[in-house]
Each structure stands twice: as structure tokens, then as C-alpha cells.
């Protein structure tokens, strides 16, 4: 199915307009700013998200990197160019002609240039970290139920197989999740790493994407998990491509 | 504690239709998807499908795909799996199991039902 | 499909005796080191019970003379010390892929 029939909405995907004019009267749903159809049974793509969100502030994130080539979505919310298929096209540019390339979660991997640069393939984030800081707790979370609830919350409530959730790595009070996702792994129902990361960054803010559920409850064996702080850390099958003078 | 309870044995004839509940307790429903694994008389264990408690969506066995319908009532925490144009190899004790936290394991299951399909 | 080749499919063992059933799987069950293979009990007339999973992890619950190894293809499940309420028919299972599989099983007898 694609959309909740019985009062056709999306429950995936609140930025969403629908009405029942599918085959047969179906409730068919598509996304604000793209007016693109979604699959209401998954995640909507980041990209149709980003689109369809207009405006917020821009979250600027400044942390120690784990890797030389771990890129951090510095550059904040832009209104991106979306495949067909719902996917950040490789190359994004905005008004000014100002010009740059992304990876498949959108995260800018290149110096910006002008209207001549180009982006020969959209690169694929295999590799994302999720750096959590949890508030004070009466005693540390431990680590098995952690890793067990973690795992579970991606698998139901993002559909992500737990396959894809390589470790959850615990050194109270910093929780980090690592997601990966080899294109070669990737079958072709299996939900996207780098959607289902996005979909948990706005739980985790209260900002849920979900369609008139509650905001995201996280418990690990009744004691709430009340994250503080979130970092977000991509890592792609080819390295960036930046130049020196960005690095000093 | 856990508990999944199902519904009583079925006899159906060739061509029919039967449905078996699954009653969840102890836990939150939509936190847990429900999967359906069959077994044969004298035989092993073969997985159906599981649905999706949360979203009530469902992802078959190809093998059972356009003959089986699996459905949740979440006001009952209640699974149900349907399978429809019964045959005499049908005939099983039907399973109902409940996803495990992390690993996809079945970590509790129903009683089971058994359906017997005879002319 | 994930095919799964449990051996043997019957055993004779007696009380106190080490038994190891093997799980040979067509394709690895292996992900970033996270083994997508499980390891149940069933005794005639009942639903299964979950004693293994993720290859080694013991179930909550369940005694220590269970035991699990193996990672990618092959996997061994293990009873240290077989004890008379343990007869009954072992399956492994694998959850690395739609449809999810299960050996054949292993009907263990008390000699």
C-alpha cells in the first residue's frame, strides 16, 4: 500500500499532500515542493525532505572528525535538486550560480565552484556515524540493552535491517551508532542508510517526520535515553574532494 | 511477561479459506513485528512472512505471496495471518513468533494452531 | 534463497556426552561481524524455543551448556553436557535475507 487508505494520509511522511485519486481510487500521496509520488510504506528520501522543507535555521556542527574523509554537514539546509527517483542529484547549485558537489545524503564533498563544475556520479555514503550525548542518568545504560533497543527502534520504526547497524558502541554518556551500507548490500526494497539517519536526526530533535505519531519515546528497559547532543558523520565509498585551503 | 496466545485448531475443506489470530501480551505491540513460520506434520519449519506492527504492513514469502494476507488490529494487539485456496499440503501447525530486539531471532512464540485441510 | 544444510539430521547420544550439530549456509550470514544466524529447541508437541542467537549469544534464561560458534558459513551449535530434558530437534535459522530459512533440523535421541 501506499498511503494510510482509511483517511489517506502518509504515515511516513507529514510533508506530504494526498487525496484518492490513485488507480482505482487509491490514496495517493506526493511530496511538498517536489510534488513528487512516495512510497508511504518507507522512508521518504532525504532529498524530497529537504525539498519539501522550505525553511529552518542552519545548523552549523563543529567537532573533532573520526576520519580524515568524514564529512559533517556543515552547509546546513539548502533547496536541493532531486532525481526522478528522489535522489540528490551529484551536482547542486543555487541562484547565484554558485555550484557544488554532494554525496547520497546531500552533504557537500567539493569546493564550490561555478556553473562549469562537474560532478561525474553520485557518490555513495556507505559508512555513517551518529554521535550521541545522553543526559545525566542514575547509573550507565548497559551496553547489551542499548545496542538491542537501538536496533530495534531502526528495524521498526525506520525499517531498517539490523544488518546495516554495524555496532553500537557505548562510553557513558557518548552513544555512537555506526551505519553501513555497501552499494553491493543494498537490495532493492532495503531502506537507505543515509534516509533512515535522517529520519532518527529529527526524532532525536523533536522534530519527527512521522505523520500524527508521537514524537519519538526512546527507553532502555523503562529508563528514558534523553539524547543532548547529536553529530553526524559521513563517510563515502570515494573520499572528498577538497581543496588544502579549506583544511587550514 | 510475554505471551503470545492463538486461536484453535481449524479443519477446512480444499479451496477454503482460514484465519488464525495471535493474541500479544506483556509488552508494547507496535514495538515488535509479528513473523509466521508453518510447520508440516513431521516436518521442519518454514517462515511465511512477517508484518509490521508499527506500520501494519507486510512482507511475504514469495512462496505464499498472492495467497496469504497477514493483518494487525493494534486496539486488541491482535496478528492475523489468512491464507486462502487451502490445499492438503497446507496442513500444518501455523506459528506466530515475535521479533527479537536486535538480530531478527524469534525470540517468543504462540502455541501454534493447528489447520488441517481434508476433503 | 539462503539454503541451509544442517548435519546430522538424527543423533543418538548419551546422558554427560558432548553433542555438536553443524549449520552450513549457501551464502555468508556475516554482516560487519554481526552473524544473522539463530539457533532453536523444539520439543514434540511444542512451539520452538530461541537458545542461540546472533551465532553465540545465549538466550536469556537458557543454561550455559548451550553453546554457539562460527561466523560467514559455517556454524556449530553445542551441548557440552547432554542432559535426558534435553531431547528434542535442534533447527538453525538464518535473518540475513527475505525469505528467512531454517536447516532441516536435528532430532536428538538419549542412547
Known amino acids: 500500500h501506499t498511503a494510510a487508505q482509511d483517511n489517506c494520509t502518509c504515515p511516513t511522511n507529514k510533508m506530504t499532500v494526498c487525496s484518492p485519486d490513485g488507480p482505482g481510487g487509491r490514496c495517493q500521496c506526493r511530496a511538498l515542493g517536489s510534488g513528487m509520488a512516495v512510497d508511504c510504506s518507507t522512508l521518504t528520501s532525504k532529498c524530497l525532505l529537504l525539498k519539501a522543507r522550505m525553511s529552518a535555521p542552519k545548523n552549523a556542527r563543529t567537532l573533532v572528525r573520526p576520519s580524515e574523509h568524514a564529512l559533517v554537514d556543515n552547509d546546513g539546509l539548502y533547496d536541493p535538486d532531486c532525481d526522478p527517483e528522489g535522489r540528490f542529484k551529484a551536482r547542486q547549485c543555487n541562484q547565484t550560480s554558485v555550484c557544488w558537489c554532494v554525496n547520497s545524503v546531500g552533504v557537500r564533498r567539493t569546493d564550490k565552484g561555478d556553473l562549469s563544475l562537474r560532478c561525474d556520479e553520485l557518490v555513495r555514503t556507505h559508512h555513517i556515524l551518529i554521535d550521541l550525548r545522553h543526559r545525566p542518568t542514575a547509573g550507565a545504560f548497559n551496553h547489551s540493552d542499548l545496542d538491542a533497543e537501538l536496533r530495534r527502534l531502526f528495524r521498526e520504526r525506520y525499517r531498517l535491517h539490523p544488518k546495516f547497524v554495524a555496532a553500537v558502541h557505548y562510553e557513558q554518556p557518548t552513544i555512537q551508532i555506526e551505519l553501513r551500507q555497501n552499494t553491493s548490500q543494498k537490495a532493492a526494497g532495503d531502506v537507505d542508510i543515509g534516509d533512515a539517519a535522517y529520519y532518527f536526526e529529527r526524532d532525536i530533535k523533536g522534530e519527527s517526520l512521522f505523520q500524527g505519531r508521537g514524537g519519538l519515546d526512546l527507553r532502555v528497559r523503562g529508563e528514558p535515553l534523553q539524547v543532548e547532543r547529536t553529530l553526524i558523520y559521513y563517510l563515502d565509498e570515494i573520499p572528498p574532494k577538497f581543496s588544502m585551503k579549506r583544511l587550514t | 511477561q510475554v505471551q503470545l496466545v492463538q486461536s484453535g485448531a481449524e479443519v477446512k475443506k480444499p479451496g477454503a479459506s482460514v484465519k488464525v489470530s495471535c493474541k500479544a501480551s506483556?509488552?508494547?505491540?507496535?514495538?515488535?513485528?509479528i513473523n509466521w513460520v508453518r510447520q508440516a506434520p513431521g516436518q521442519g519449519l518454514e517462515w511465511m512472512g512477517v508484518?509490521?506492527?508499527?506500520?501494519?504492513?507486510?512482507s511475504y514469502n514469495q512462496k505464499f505471496k498472492g495467497r496469504v494476507t497477514m493483518t494487525t488490529d493494534t486496539s486488541t494487539s491482535t496478528a492475523y495471518m489468512e491464507l486462502r485456496s487451502l490445499r492438503s499440503d497446507d496442513t500444518a501447525v501455523y506459528y506466530c513468533?515475535?521479533?527479537?530486539?536486535?538480530?531478527?531471532?524469534?525470540?517468543?512464540w504462540g502455541q501454534g494452531t493447528m489447520v488441517t485441510v481434508s476433503s | 534463497d539462503i539454503q541451509m544444510t544442517q548435519s546430522p539430521s538424527s543423533l543418538s547420544a548419551s546422558v554427560g556426552d558432548r553433542v555438536t550439530i553443524t549449520c552450513r549456509v549457501s551464502?555468508?550470514?556475516?554482516?560487519?561481524?554481526?552473524?544473522?544466524m539463530h539457533w532453536y529447541q523444539q520439543k514434540p508437541g511444542k512451539a520452538p524455543k530461541l537458545l542461540i542467537y546472533?551465532?553465540?549469544n545465549l538466550e536469556s534464561g537458557v543454561p550455559s551448556r548451550f553453546s554457539g560458534s562460527g561466523s560467514g558459513t559455517d556454524f556449530t551449535f553445542t551441548i557440552s553436557s547432554l542432559q535426558p530434558e534435553d531431547i528434542a530437534t535442534y533447527y538453525c535459522?538464518?535473518?540475513?535475507?527475505?525469505?528467512?530459512?531454517f536447516g532441516g533440523g536435528t532430532k536428538l535421541e538419549i542412547k
Open positions: 513468533a515475535r521479533y527479537g530486539d536486535g538480530y531478527n531471532q524469534f525470540d517468543y
Open positions: 506483556g509488552y508494547t505491540f507496535t514495538d515488535y513485528s
Open positions: 508484518i509490521s506492527t508499527y506500520y501494519g504492513d507486510a
Open positions: 551464502e555468508s550470514v556475516d554482516s560487519y561481524g554481526n552473524n544473522f
Open positions: 546472533r551465532a553465540s
Open positions: 535459522q538464518q535473518s540475513y535475507e527475505d525469505p528467512y530459512t
